[in-house]
């Protein structure tokens, strides 16, 4: 969209699961009809076509002329439309990568979950509610990012190395908080500043490794808008 | 071209009843949603009633609701507004639109209007 | 119901001037606004959707922008053929709502 005009950003991570987001306000009057229900949702590509199977039919409607100072836009697609009596179409190959949950949508949830989020998935989403009595919308744009855990220096490491891991997201903003923990066995065991460990925003510095430290570590990136993003790295320290 | 024709207004007294036709050509009539719009003289646009393409939903404002009928005749590329029990504030210019989308609900094809005077 | 509500209610202008019609939606509408044009005795026609894309035909003269509350429509440089009332329309929800027109006469 042209500056100045923007709608909700939701992020997601390649590759694994986004959910963008979609419960109007219903009055309770209307609770009991959600069975009747009717969503589509619609897709806008942020850039170059939208990955489908040459020749598959799009959507009826205009084509309208994109803001100035912008080159074409992809086509509008129809992801995903659920009739009123349950009945679905949509557009292959997302198909069955794209799921709306039919208990969240007899609640008013119209989300759309999409199993894994890939990159071709981002840009603008317009999702259209009918209702009996009601028409309503949300818009939304996806963006996607890639999570990373880098080491430096890289590859396997010798007792009483130094290491530092690097928790990264390709996101502009800054995380509000990052937090590192350990796989041990069952469950994650925060990982702690100390003499051992020092912590300083998206980075971890082991100064001095032992084979102890060999295997997984983990960082979780949650940022202000509440989208986390949980990365690991597997460190191998030779004896 | 796309094109929209409205006819069927005329003088009517209040409490009686009137159809308005909308004839569609240029485009898949079939694959659009459609809409009535109206605007008293001199005054702004009021939106009235709406059909999906597959007629599986229909909405009217509440100024019409239980008084008009909006239907979609695919077969004859043709929009109707049954309208009864008139009232003088429903005087005003008739138009046949187009919705852009079945899923985005703005008008991008318009007839000339009909008018239509409710008076006794 | 969401109201629109439009200001000015009319402007006068001349050619070449640049011209700014705004409209205020009583809750968040996201970027779902159009704006029409329409002339005496004529059908409305469709010029911006989704607050800020043009549609066929129109000439880049004519721009929109906002998103939540508050959208504008601007001419950056008055035509003759511009003169004429601007409505401004939420496509977000039912029933679709319009604001109560810009009249835009010649100074």
């Known amino acids: 969209l042209q500056p100045g005009a923007e709608v909700p950003v939701v992020w997601a991570q390649e590759g694994a699961p986004a959910q963008l987001p979609c419960s109007p306000t219903i009055p309770l009057q209307d609770l009991s009809l959600l069975r009747r229900a009717g969503v589509t949702w619609q897709h806008q590509p942020d850039s170059g076509p939208p990955a489908a199977a040459p020749g598959h039919p799009l959507a009826p409607g205009p084509h309208p002329a994109a803001p100035s100072s912008w080159g074409p836009r992809p086509r509008r697609y129809t992801v995903l439309s659920v009739g009123p009596g349950g009945l679905r179409s949509g557009r292959l190959p997302l198909q069955p990568r794209v799921q709306l949950d039919e208990r969240g949508r007899q609640r008013g949830d119209f989300s759309l979950w999409l199993r894994p989020a890939r990159r071709a998935d981002a840009g603008e989403y317009r999702a259209a509610v009918h209702l009996r009595d009601r028409a309503l919308s949300c818009r939304l744009r996806l963006r996607l990012g890639q999570a990373s855990m880098t080491a430096s220096p890289p590859g396997s490491l010798r007792a009483s190395d130094w290491v530092i891991l690097n928790c990264s997201f390709s996101r502009p903003d800054r995380p509000a908080s990052v937090h590192w923990f350990r796989n041990r066995g069952q469950g994650r065991v925060p990982v702690r500043e100390s003499p051992h460990h020092h912590l300083a925003e998206s980075f971890l510095f082991l100064p001095q490794v032992s084979p102890m430290d060999s295997g997984p570590w983990g960082c979780i990136l949650t940022y202000r808008d509440g989208f986390n993003v949980s990365i690991m790295y597997n460190l191998t320290v030779l004896g | 071209q796309v094109q929209l024709v409205e006819s069927g207004g005329g003088l009517v007294k209040p409490g009686g009843s009137l159809r308005l036709s909308c004839a569609a050509s240029?485009?898949?009539?079939?694959?659009?949603?459609m809409s009535w719009i109206r605007q008293a003289p001199g005054k702004g646009l009021e939106w009235v009633s709406y059909?999906?393409?597959?007629?599986?939903?229909?909405y009217y404002a509440d100024t019409v609701k239980g008084r008009f009928t909006i239907s979609r005749d695919d077969a004859k590329n043709s929009l109707y507004l049954q309208m009864n029990s008139l009232r003088a504030e429903d005087t005003a210019v008739y138009y046949c639109?187009?919705?852009?989308?079945?899923?985005?609900?703005?008008?991008?094809?318009w007839g000339q209007g009909t008018l239509v005077t409710v008076s006794s | 119901d969401i109201q629109m509500t439009q200001s000015p209610s009319s402007v006068s202008a001349s050619v070449g001037d640049r011209v700014t019609i705004t409209c205020k939606a009583s809750?968040?509408?996201?970027?779902?606004v159009a704006w029409y044009q329409q002339k005496p005795g004529k059908a409305p026609k469709l010029l911006i959707y989704?607050?800020?894309y043009r549609y066929t035909g129109v000439p880049s003269r004519f721009s929109g922008s906002g998103s939540g509350t508050d959208f504008t429509l601007t001419i950056s440089s008055l035509q003759p053929e511009d003169f004429a009332t601007y409505y401004c329309?939420?496509?977000?929800?039912?029933?679709?709502?319009f604001g109560q027109g810009t009249k835009l006469e010649i100074k």
């Open positions: 639109t187009r919705v852009a989308y079945d899923y985005e609900w703005y008008f991008d094809v």
């Open positions: 240029g485009f898949t009539f079939s694959s659009y949603a």
């Open positions: 059909v999906t393409s597959g007629g599986d939903y229909i």
């Open positions: 809750q968040d509408v996201t970027t779902a």
């Open positions: 989704s607050a800020s």
């Open positions: 329309q939420q496509h977000d929800q039912s029933p679709w709502t």
